[in-house]
Interface confidence: low
């Protein structure tokens, strides 16, 4: 049957709707018009629009299709950056408090240490900083030059105070006598393991939010292919060359049509999900030693233990180590070791972690409810785009893409459709590049989160801890591995709390090598901007 | 083991353009920042160009900027300068080295060069 | 920029003998975080620069021990103990406190 003339025949509200879009009235002819040169808007009879008009339909389907990704992915998109960043903030604000019970621990009970062990720790803690955004620092050198740099200061000015400044050259003998003598016994192994595995879970953690991001700015930004544009012009707008301008089009043709512009981006779903999914697995595992609020808060405690256990062992070391760096030393000097009494100061402070509302776990468990409620995310979005644009409901008295019709069938529709365009093909192109790019990160990090999934993965622990725990060591189920317990005992006021005040600071934390320069807008740090004096500017 | 492999130098008159190429392999690149590093041929070092892991940060001497641009695809595992404008006193065999974070800017390993000469 | 200035620009030692090269900086290389970064390098004939010693005194892994690195503010020195044939080639010095990162003029090490 033809199809009903258009209701106006001089095009006048067409001309008077296109003029919103494109200013100026040449493109639009002013009576109907055969229309053989269209190729979107195919007519059946005399029609309004002309090839000038359908280009520029097809530009505008295409932002809208835009628009209303970007809008779709807009509460997703706030929900990831913005943990991104407060989680960011989260850790190197842990990282400064870490430092600061450290130098605090170091001030209180080994004055004579500082300000050198400030410098250690702030170097330490830098590199903390460094490894948790991205930096290929090995945790086990980190470790290693903490207490290579502590153990000559340790044994100048603690064990052996007597010696001159001419025997101070017996630096890099004391560096190397701490690894061979084990002077520290198995603390430095065991920090290394604690700090390993809580870093490397917290690193991966923020890489995946960064990820997150990532895949959301990558579909939000799609361009869309000219022939979906070409579909969905045909969807929108093809019934306003028929004068129809109060149509609107099939709910059923809307999601054919959308499932076929989006195509590409449906097939993130799987790794989407799964992405989700191993998120979840990786945050339920991060307490204990894969937490690293847990473990850097509790560091001061086992750094103060090994210097003490350093001074249980002084009057052995002391002459084994004077035997060993005479050469450097030219003479023997006479051990200053005292009882360890005297160093031990009881007020030693040690971390008690106090239940509170909002630590950095309940907000971890938190963002992954919310993410949880964007699993289908992908698979959903043609439907969502649909229900929040103009679509007939119950698909009765609608646009089809090429007449006015009573009830919308799907296979009518396609029949009629197939001289026109082809769906199958369009579904069959695959994905965009950037979106075959994306899904191999997502299958990358998902590799990553389910290596690193805790307590049952020991994984982790094959590529942190190859030569396994030493006697003394703590396994992974041992509470007392971190923080302490006994008559030193003092219950710290947490700082994490997200609503309280970020920028609480320790006393000490002005002491040399407290500086830390972190640019949270990225989600990687750069060597200048931590390499630059304060003084020189670097741009 | 550490490898870095530049390509891409090549004789070229002042004026033009040139880009160059490192291959890293060996160690996980998309983690490490990167730096461009030349030596004049009369032995003289100089750094040009240098590009944090992600990439967002490039910092550039002013004897190059504006004229010079590194990047790097961290999926290919590769570095890049790409050279404009070239002037006489950029001839120089040009080195991608990596730059420790934990050396703080030390540059632990470096490729064996790539030569660039610029002349009419 | 910082000015490297490395003496003497050409040292020549026999072997097993120790060698001394100086670098001076134009100001000085204590960042604001206490630490000092200065490098050592060395480039064999044909041979791209190998990093030997960061941060004044820390030996790069697989460096012997013979090499040793000291000094503070404006004025280091790297030590060679006992020279050995492999050690000879150009010395240089590098700075990364300071933005951008600068090389001294080097140093060749050469049979006397």
């Known amino acids: 049957q033809p199809p009903p003339p258009p209701p106006d025949a001089t095009c006048h509200q067409v001309r008077s709707f296109f003029q919103r879009l494109q200013p100026g009235l040449k493109w639009v002819p002013e009576t109907p018009v055969p229309g053989s040169d269209l190729q979107v808007c195919l007519p059946k009879g005399p029609t309004c629009c002309s090839r000038k008009m359908e280009e520029k339909y097809q530009l505008t389907a295409r932002l809208n299709m835009e628009q209303l990704l970007q809008s779709a992915s807009m509460e997703l998109k706030f929900l990831i950056i913005q943990n991104a960043a407060v989680f960011q903030e989260a850790f190197e604000i842990v990282v400064r408090h870490a430092k600061n019970y450290t130098n605090a621990m170091f001030k209180n009970n080994y004055p004579s240490l500082t300000p050198q062990a400030f410098e250690f720790v702030g170097e330490f803690f830098t590199d903390v900083s460094l490894y948790i955004l991205g930096s290929d620092i090995n945790v086990d050198d980190m470790v290693n030059e903490l207490f290579d740099s502590l153990f000559p200061v340790i044994y100048t000015q603690l064990m052996n105070p007597g010696l001159p400044d001419s025997a101070l050259d017996i630096n890099e003998c004391l560096r190397g006598a701490r690894r061979d003598l084990k002077v520290f016994g198995n603390f430095p192994k065991l920090i290394m393991t604690q700090v390993s595995k809580s870093l490397q879970v917290t690193r991966i953690f923020l890489q995946a939010l960064n990820l997150g991001i990532e895949v959301i700015n990558t579909t939000d930004h799609l361009k869309f292919s000219k022939d979906c544009g070409r579909m969905l012009t045909r969807m929108w707008y093809c019934s306003y060359c028929q004068g129809l301008m109060m149509v609107k089009p099939c709910g059923g043709y809307c999601n054919v049509v959308m499932q076929g512009c989006m195509a590409g981006v449906v097939e993130i779903d799987k790794y989407w999900r799964e992405y989700i999914l191993s998120l979840e697995e990786l945050v339920n595992g991060m307490y204990r030693i894969y937490d690293m609020e847990n473990v850097l808060l509790g560091l001061f405690s086992t750094i103060h233990d090994s210097i003490q256990y350093v001074q249980k062992n002084a009057g052995k070391l002391t002459t084994t180590i004077g035997k060993l760096c005479a050469h450097s030393q030219q003479r023997q000097y006479r051990s200053a070791y005292y009882p360890e009494d005297l160093f031990i100061d009881k007020k030693v402070l040690k971390v008690a972690h106090v239940e509170h509302e909002e630590t950095l776990s309940s907000r971890r468990r938190e963002l992954i409810q919310k993410l949880k409620s964007f699993i289908s995310f992908y698979s959903a979005l043609p439907g969502y785009i649909c229900s929040h644009s103009p679509v007939a409901e119950n698909d009765t008295l609608c646009w089809n893409g090429q007449e006015l019709v009573e009830r919308y069938s799907q296979k009518a529709a396609r029949n009629g459709m197939k001289n026109q365009f082809n769906l199958h093909e369009l579904k069959m192109k695959g994905p965009e590049p950037v979106v075959s790019q994306i899904i191999d990160k997502l299958k990358h990090i998902n590799q990553l989160l389910r290596t690193m999934s805790m307590p049952k993965g020991r994984v982790l622990d094959k590529n942190l801890d190859e030569e396994g725990f030493e006697s003394g060591d703590c396994g992974d189920d041992e509470d007392e591995c971190i923080g302490g317990s006994g008559d030193g005992m003092i219950k710290v006021k947490n700082q994490l709390r997200f609503l309280a005040e970020l920028a609480y600071d320790l006393d000490v934390d002005d002491a040399p090598g407290n500086s830390q320069q972190a640019t949270p807008k990225d989600n990687e740090i750069s060597t200048f901007h931590n390499l630059g004096n304060v003084h020189s500017p670097l741009k | 083991e550490v490898q870095l492999v530049e390509s891409g130098g090549d004789l070229v008159k002042p004026g033009g353009s040139l880009k160059l190429s490192c291959a890293a392999s060996g160690f996980a690149f998309g983690t490490y920042d990167m730096s461009w590093v030349r030596q004049t041929p009369e032995k003289r070092l100089e750094w040009v160009a240098y590009i944090s892991s992600g990439g967002n940060s490039p910092y550039y001497p002013q004897t190059v900027k504006g004229r010079f641009t590194i990047s790097r695809d961290n999926a290919k595992n590769t570095l890049y300068l790409q050279m404009s404008s070239l002037k006489s006193e950029d001839t120089a065999m040009y080195y991608c080295a990596r730059q420790n974070i934990a050396r703080r800017g030390a540059m632990d390993f470096w490729g064996q060069g790539a030569s660039v000469t610029v002349s009419s | 920029d910082v000015v490297l200035t490395q003496s003497p620009l050409s040292q020549p030692v026999s072997l097993g003998d120790q060698a001394s090269i100086s670098c001076t900086s134009s100001?000085?290389?204590?960042?604001?975080?206490?630490?000092?970064?200065l490098h050592w390098y060395l480039q064999k004939p044909g041979q791209s620069p190998k990093l030997l010693i960061y941060k004044v005194s820390n030996r790069f892994s697989g460096v012997p021990d013979r090499f040793s690195g000291s000094g503070s503010g404006t004025d280091f020195t790297l030590k060679i103990s006992r020279v050995e044939a492999e050690d000879l080639g150009v010395y240089f010095c590098?700075?990364?406190?300071?933005?951008?990162?600068?090389f001294g003029g080097g140093t060749k090490l050469e049979i006397k």
């Open positions: 590098s700075q990364s406190t300071h933005v951008p990162p600068t």
């Open positions: 100001q000085s290389l204590l960042h604001s975080n206490g630490n000092t970064y």
